[in-house]
Interface confidence: low
């Protein structure tokens, strides 16, 4: 018969024949032959392979380097890599999370729209009319101006995006 040019799923073509791939968590030791099945071996401690494969070496689990502000979020198995995340107050610089940077703070006049996570930075938004922020913070939202009317007071100084309104007593008519 003609040698196969394509193999079924979870197989690979070698020496004009189809061999079984090794399952996740195992590496290839020797290809199949006309008489023998593919030989696979489990990955060692701190190694993994996450797909059906014909790799002769397992990949090393990622090292979450504390020197780079990293810690283990999820320990690796023979089939999965270690997942790193950043220490509190920091977030990853890339999807691979190879290093961390400090969460951004929102400047006065801006409030936090979305608090940072281990993988995404703080999202800031300008305080709209009627709201203010007078601090640089990675947590504080824009606060609404004080309502002088509800306190039976009048506005003495208008608010800005960085300052609250200043309330004062109403001028009273003398008898």
């Amino acid at each position: 018969p003609e040698p196969p040019t394509a193999c079924r799923e979870k197989q690979y073509l070698i020496n004009s024949q189809c061999c079984s791939l090794c399952q996740p968590g195992q590496k290839l030791v020797s290809d199949c032959t006309e008489f023998t099945e593919t030989e696979c071996l489990p990955c060692g401690e701190s190694e993994f392979l996450d797909t059906w494969n014909r790799e002769t070496h397992c990949h090393q689990h990622k090292y979450c380097d504390p020197n780079l502000g990293l810690r283990v979020q999820q320990k690796g198995t023979s089939e999965t890599d270690t997942i790193c995340t950043c220490e509190e107050g920091w977030h990853c610089t890339s999807e691979a999370c190879e290093s961390c940077v400090l969460h951004r703070s929102c400047s006065p006049g801006f409030g936090v729209k979305q608090i940072a996570t281990g993988v995404s930075d703080t999202i800031c938004e300008p305080c709209p009319v009627g709201f203010f922020s007078n601090v640089s913070s990675a947590f504080e939202k824009c606060h609404p101006w004080t309502s002088c009317e509800t306190k039976d007071l009048v506005v003495q100084q208008a608010g800005t995006n960085k300052t609250d309104v200043v309330c004062g007593p109403q001028d009273r008519l003398r008898a």
Partner: antibody, heavy 119, light 112 residues
Framework: QVQLVQSGAEVKKPGASVKVSCKAS????????MNWVRQAPGQGLEWMGN????????NYNQKFKGRVTMTTDTSTSTAYMELRSLRSDDTAVYYC????????????WGQGTTVTVSS | DIVMTQTPLSLPVTPGEPASISCRSS???????????LHWYLQKPGQSPQLLIY???NRFFGVPDRFSGSGSGTDFTLKISRVEAEDVGVYYC?????????FGGGTKVEIK
């Protein structure tokens, strides 16, 4: 031992593109980021960016954004750097350099590839 | 971008004598984890750069102990306790704390 072997010298015309390769051996290719650094004649070193071969994520120097593309082929443990719309001031030696994991510095360098841009 | 400024530009040295190169960064290179992401590279004539010192004070494999790095925050120094003829070349400081990573302009060390 760790080795990074780069492709040979290139001569290009302004406006053309160049693709430099860097074949790695002696370590697990997918475990380390690969950087690209260039050096114009008689000048200092300039970092162009890096790529994580495992995920394909890239970090580019804004100066080159839109003109540079970094890729890898994990089956051959090779990193590539393509620079488009070449100008005469792109004439330089281009180096690949591995990023040491715990070092966070470039611990092993290729021999360099000379790219000359001339009409 | 962080600007790295090296002095001197050129340093004529006598074998056996000490030598010192300074590097200043426009921003602090200290991470909250207390590491300083300042490195030193040497480019010998006609060769690729090679790593000498990483993260401020750590000598890379095979680097002789006559090389030492020091400094803090934004001011850094590379010292060679006794210069040897093989130490000639251009020395670069570099930071890897903020993208884009940047290098100093280089200090050319040559024998008097």
């Amino acid at each position: 031992q760790v080795q990074l072997v780069q492709s040979g010298a290139e001569v290009k015309k302004p406006g053309a593109s160049v693709k430099v390769s860097c074949k790695a051996s002696g370590y697990t290719f997918t475990g380390y980021n690969m950087n690209w650094v260039r050096q114009a004649p008689g000048q200092g070193l300039e970092w162009m960016g890096n790529i994580d071969p495992y995920y394909g994520n890239t970090n580019y120097n804004q100066k080159f954004k839109g003109r540079v593309t970094m890729t890898t082929d994990t089956s051959t443990s090779t990193a590539y750097m393509e620079l488009r719309s070449l100008r005469s001031d792109d004439t330089a030696v281009y180096y690949c350099a591995r990023l040491g994991l715990q070092l966070y510095a470039m611990d092993y360098w290729g021999q360099g590839t000379t790219v000359t841009v001339s009409s | 971008d962080i600007v790295m400024t090296q002095t001197p530009l050129s340093l004529p040295v006598t074998p056996g004598e000490p030598a010192s190169i300074s590097c200043r960064s426009s921003q602090s290179l200290v991470h909250s984890n207390a590491n300083t992401y300042l490195h030193w590279y040497l480019q010998k004539p006609g060769q690729s750069p090679q790593l000498l010192i990483y993260k401020l004070t750590n000598r890379f494999f095979g680097v002789p102990d006559r090389f030492s790095g020091s400094g803090s925050g934004t001011d850094f120094t590379l010292k060679i306790s006794r210069v040897e003829a093989e130490d000639v070349g251009v020395y670069y400081c570099s930071q890897s704390i903020h993208v884009p990573w940047t290098f100093g302009g280089g200090t050319k060390v040559e024998i008097k």
